[in-house]
Amino acid sequence: EEELQVIQPDKSVLVAAGETATLRCTATSLIPVGPIQWFRGAGPGRELIYNQKEGHFPRVTTVSDLTKRNNMDFSIRIGNITPADAGTYYCVKFRKGSPDDVEFKSGAGTELSVRAKPSAPVVSGPAARATPQHTVSFTCESHGFSPRDITLKWFKNGNELSDFQTNVDPVGESVSYSIHSTAKVVLTREDVHSQVICEVAHVTLQGDPLRGTANLSETIRVPPTLEVTQQPVRAENQVNVTCQVRKFYPQRLQLTWLENGNVSRTETASTVTENKDGTYNWMSWLLVNVSAHRDDVKLTCQVEHDGQPAVSKSHDLKVSAHPKEQGSNTAAENTGSNERNIY
């Protein structure tokens, strides 16, 4: 009688993560008597995957009924496949022996490859805000995919970016891989509504790439421009001075009025108006009683924006001249800022 052969007809099997892998194996003879076992890998460090008679293998089922009298089909199914299951599987026939059964013949092996989807890309920006014209870095990470081949692209408002560096780890063979990419983005004053998108394409995604986004509103700081103007007289001896704070982002802003260097009033921006580009405008005004002053008054609008060093703009109010002849007559909307009389 011809010596028993162990046949594994499939050189390789490709399975998607989460699915069931079928590993086929048949023997050509019932002799010698002894169990079939399945291993992943070869040599002394091999991992036992299934033993016909003992062991605990909750993920493994047999394709045919191994208990049937002349059964020679030793194929198995492994459920809920993960990338960690990738490797070469051997169907091995043992001959009963003492004290232990003896390996008699092995199949040629079946390589199990696992296709696993990448995780949703996570995009993170710089820890601190930056101002327009500065270059900031964004990182994108995705994990757990297999095989290693993957494509990553960066976009800003739909326009593809070119200044980025990408690494796929590890470099050598692994059950699954991770991708890490860093893109450099130059900020503009119009970027409050902008988005940076990281797009990952992989064979498991069937042409429907995964995207991760970051809003530049989390990253950008647009410093305000200040303009101090003197408004028409409201009453004899009273002058209205306004401070226009324009095009700032984020909203966190504190304004202080100074008279000749002394703090007159401090307020926090509340009822702001939003511009189309996402930046904000705000106006504060001060009512000055000129008759209370003998000398000229230097009025300063000092603004601290988003915790940054204060910026200021000053306006000289000449007491000697008649109020009606002074300053600009530009009409300004009264935003309801608190009145402040100087006596």
């Epitope: 002394p44 008679k53 062991g55 208990t67 232990d100």
Partner: antibody
Framework: EVQLQQSGAELVKPGASVKLSCTAS????????IHWVKQRTEQGLEWIGR????????KYAPKFQGKATITADTSSNTAYLQLNSLTSEDTAVYSC???????WGQGTLVTVSA | QIVLTQSPAIMSASPGEKVTLTCSAS???????LYWYQQKPGSSPKLWIY???NLASGVPARFSGSGSGTSYSLTISSMEAEDAASYFC?????????FGGGTKLEIK
């Protein structure tokens, strides 16, 4: 549902023999090895041996060679452990387990006493 | 035969404490064949960890197993009262199969 039902407690005299049974339900014993394990009060587990009920092949720990005999009857889906020449050292709980040790019988207490 | 030595033989731990039980083999054991069992008084042993690091069905995730060659361990990340029991390691890599002497784990 897999279950292993063991026979009841035994009180035996020194020098005598005893035969314990382990009846399986929820699986066919022909398909798996059946192991026997000894546990003395407040002590560890000792593997006695196992049988392949399909062909009757047995393996024993050296310590139990000659002391224990494991047999099986596939028609009744039952495995047996026979202990002979009993001494006080054999007083213990004896448990059967399905190959893989995921399922155990409830144990049988054997007390050897004059 | 392969002798499995467990340490400590007895130990107590406070709730929330991290606990590590060790099992040392006199010669190398393939990790596929190293199992752990939990046993409570009056009950049969329960399969707790199989193939060194896989938790049996129903075993809480605070348990983990690791090791290779001659050195294996069972770890409880945060001890709970219900974990008080005896734990036995077991090898079925080669005949005769053997069990460790056990570690009795008590709650403080």
């Amino acid at each position: 549902e897999v279950q292993l039902q063991q026979s009841g407690a035994e009180l035996v005299k020194p020098g005598a023999s005893v035969k314990l049974s382990c009846t399986a339900s929820g699986f066919n014993i022909k398909d798996y090895y059946i192991h026997w394990v000894k546990q003395r009060t407040e002590q560890g587990l000792e593997w006695i041996g196992r049988i392949d009920p399909e062909d009757g092949e047995t393996k024993y720990a050296p310590k139990f060679q000659g002391k224990a005999t494991i047999t099986a009857d596939t028609s009744s889906n039952t495995a047996y452990l026979q202990l002979n020449s009993l001494t006080s050292e054999d007083t213990a709980v004896y448990s059967c387990a399905k190959g893989g040790f995921a399922y155990w019988g409830q144990g049988t207490l054997v007390t050897v006493s004059a | 035969q392969i002798v499995l030595t467990q340490s400590p033989a007895i130990m107590s731990a406070s709730p929330g404490e991290k606990v590590t039980l060790t099992c040392s083999a006199s010669s190398s054991v393939s990790s596929s064949y190293l199992y752990w069992y939990q046993q409570k008084p009056g009950s049969s042993p329960k399969l707790w960890i199989y193939s060194t690091s896989n938790l049996a069905s129903g075993v809480p995730a605070r348990f983990s197993g690791s090791g290779s060659g001659t050195s294996y361990s069972l770890t409880i990340s945060s001890m709970e009262a219900e974990d008080a029991a005896s734990y036995f390691c077991h090898q079925w890599s080669s005949h005769p199969y053997t069990f460790g002497g056990g570690t009795k784990l008590e709650i403080k």
